[in-house]
């Protein structure tokens, strides 16, 4: 008998800026939007108003099983993986065009679902488009090589797709991280099952409709929203999945690594937590530094794994910088409605995270740290928190050591370059880092000394799809973006011929 799944109907949504569209609400499996097998749905909330936007289907283990089966068939039974890679590139290019033609809508969906400002959302969508364009270009350019080992032999390598890829993304950059994961996987001939964060599924499902529209074959892209403990666990534990890419907390990342290894020794990419240091040297230009510090920690309401959440300032500039930082935040940085162009910072994405951040602010006060500015929520409705700066902190405080994942930063003083680097490197994390200096030699010397996957000099949280991103130490392993990511989605086969 032919398997039958109930279709999930889209809902019409009018966004706060007046744009209206049809939002898919079903699980996207085998190019169909379907209801979960048990019929369950869950509400998606607008964090700016705390209102329910719509209900979407919540995948069960059985739904994930079916998605894996469909993806498995797409990989093994169709020409997707074996066709001329230029054809995959053409489809990715069409997908980029489609996303670009709808950038206003997709940015608005992102602002509604995530709570980030419309301007920031637009930047995220732009990076997503660029990821797709890069992937389209790289699809037939990432190749093996020939190896000369002397007379009598010919040697070459081929790069082959891995197979079914499980991909789990967080709620802080829903569309951007979807593209970071899906674009290179498809370029290299893999097939994907992506679990968006339960709280931010809207753009993932809308993106799925664009995949179908441009002609990506059934089973190649599957989107399964739902709770991590069922959907995420099903992906990490299933032996048919050969590659798992996870972005999220270090704690969950460790269990993903264990489960992925125990199930079938999956290849894994982990992009995990951070407690990144932002070093400001005496010679830094304060006027240029302030926006970098703000982007470092208050961009996306601090909900960035690479956030510069520990600022270390050289003693000669410390007092001046603190005063300037306070004035800048209190006059230039507005918090509120993501659709209001005047606001730099929107809402925290969900209630749970809002409560976590407010709890950390309370912990900081109890630990004896002083508040330079902020420290309170904004308004009665929605999850808004004023940018918060703690100073007079010591390295043993929880607010200095633990990832808060919100608009909260600590500022401490250092004397020498070596001391600053030592403080920066004292964390078990190693995702991002920042250096503010007018001296190129200082910048490059310190960059070499910092234990981090990314070092930003005179900028921060500044991403480009052509530049790899990832962590060292407990911030994970593997890289996303850049040429490096394409190799993460291939297996190398060596061929040695005796002539």
């Amino acid at each position: 008998t032919k398997l039958h799944f109930d279709t999930a109907e889209p809902v019409k949504i009018t966004l706060p800026n007046g744009l209206t569209y049809e939002q898919p609400t079903g699980l996207f499996i085998n190019n169909k939007f379907m209801k979960a097998q048990d019929g369950k749905t869950y509400p998606v909330e607008d964090p700016s108003t705390e209102n329910t936007v719509c209900e979407v289907s919540s995948a069960t283990t059985e739904d994930v099983e079916y998605a894996i089966e469909c993806a498995d068939r797409a990989f093994h039974d169709t020409e997707w993986a074996t066709q001329d890679p230029r054809e995959r590139g053409r489809l990715l290019s069409k997908l980029a065009d489609e996303l670009e033609s709808q950038i206003d809508l997709v940015s608005s969906i992102e602002a509604l679902d995530n709570g980030k400002t419309l301007a920031l959302a637009r930047g995220d969508v732009t990076i997503a488009i660029n990821c797709l364009r890069d992937a389209a270009a790289y699809a037939d350019k990432v190749n093996g090589r020939t190896i000369n080992t002397g007379d009598g032999y010919m040697n070459f390598t081929t790069l082959e797709p891995i197979g079914v890829c499980g991909q789990i993304i967080p709620w802080n950059f829903p569309i951007m991280m979807l593209a970071w994961k899906i674009a290179p996987a498809l370029a290299m001939g893999n097939v994907c099952i992506l679990k968006p964060a339960a709280v931010t599924p809207l753009n993932a499902l809308y993106f799925a409709s664009l995949c179908k529209k441009v002609g990506i074959p059934a089973g190649v892209v599957n989107i399964v929203p739902g709770p991590g403990r069922t959907v995420g666990a099903a992906l990490t534990n299933d032996p048919r999945i050969r590659k798992l890419a996870f972005t999220g907390s270090t704690e969950v990342g460790k269990s993903v690594a264990v489960d992925s290894s125990e199930s079938n020794l999956k290849k894994i990419t982990l992009e995990l937590g951070g407690k990144s240091a932002h070093l400001v040297f005496d010679d830094a230009n304060i006027k240029k530094t302030l926006p970098n510090l703000v982007n470092g920690i208050f961009k996306n309401a601090g909900q960035i794994c690479s956030s510069g959440s520990r600022i270390y300032v050289q003693e000669g500039i410390y007092d001046e910088l603190l005063a300037a930082f306070k004035a800048y935040l209190e006059t230039e940085i507005k918090v509120g409605n993501p659709f209001d162009k005047a606001n730099f910072q929107g809402a925290i994405t969900n209630r749970q995270q809002f409560d976590t951040i407010m709890n950390y602010i309370d912990i900081g006060k109890k630990e004896g740290a002083k508040i330079l500015t902020g420290g309170e929520k904004v308004g009665d409705k929605g999850y808004f928190i004023r940018p918060t700066v703690f100073y007079d902190v010591n390295e043993d405080m929880r607010i200095v050591k633990e990832e808060i994942f919100g608009p909260v930063v600590t500022v401490a003083k250092f004397k020498t370059l070596e001391e600053g680097v030592e403080m920066a490197n004292s964390s078990e994390f190693g995702l991002g880092s920042g250096i503010e200096t007018e001296s190129l030699s200082t910048g490059l010397k310190v960059a070499k000394m910092l234990k981090a996957g990314t070092v930003w000099i005179n900028t921060y949280n500044d991403f480009d799809s052509r530049v790899p991103f990832g962590g060292v130490k407990q911030s994970g392993y593997g890289r996303e973006m850049g040429e490096e990511v394409y190799h993460a989605y291939t297996e190398v086969k060596a061929v040695r011929i005796k002539l």
């Epitope: 008998t1 032919k2 398997l3 498995d72 068939r73 039974d77």
Partner: nanobody
């Protein structure tokens, strides 16, 4: 019209063996990735094993080392050899491919 017909189930004791068959018509087993799934009483559907069109096989960790999936291209039939059966293997077993699934065959393991 596609038809998948499972057979070979039955009541056996723990430690015994069974061989399930899945005869396909209107559908070529060798060019399609084929799976065995099972549903235990009161539980959801659980994947058991896959035989790929390209020839490879994969097994759920719960059955690895005990079950073997195979196919006979000439007979257009998929098989599941189940050894060292355990009470927790009790379920209705279904074979499937390309969005089709058979009616299932009952396997009961009990002493």
């Amino acid at each position: 019209q596609v038809q998948l017909v499972e057979s070979g189930g039955g009541l056996v004791q723990p430690g015994d063996s069974l061989r399930l068959s899945c005869a396909a018509s209107g559908f070529t087993v060798s060019t399609n990735t084929m799976t065995w799934v099972r549903q235990a009483p009161g539980k959801g559907l659980e994947w058991v094993s896959t035989k790929y069109s390209t020839g490879g096989t994969t097994y759920a960790n719960s059955v690895k080392g005990r079950f073997t999936i195979s196919r006979d291209n000439a007979k257009n039939t998929l098989y599941l050899q189940m050894n060292n059966l355990k009470p927790e293997d009790t379920a209705v077993y279904y074979c499937g491919g390309a969005d089709y699934r058979g009616q299932g065959t009952q396997v009961t393991v009990s002493s």
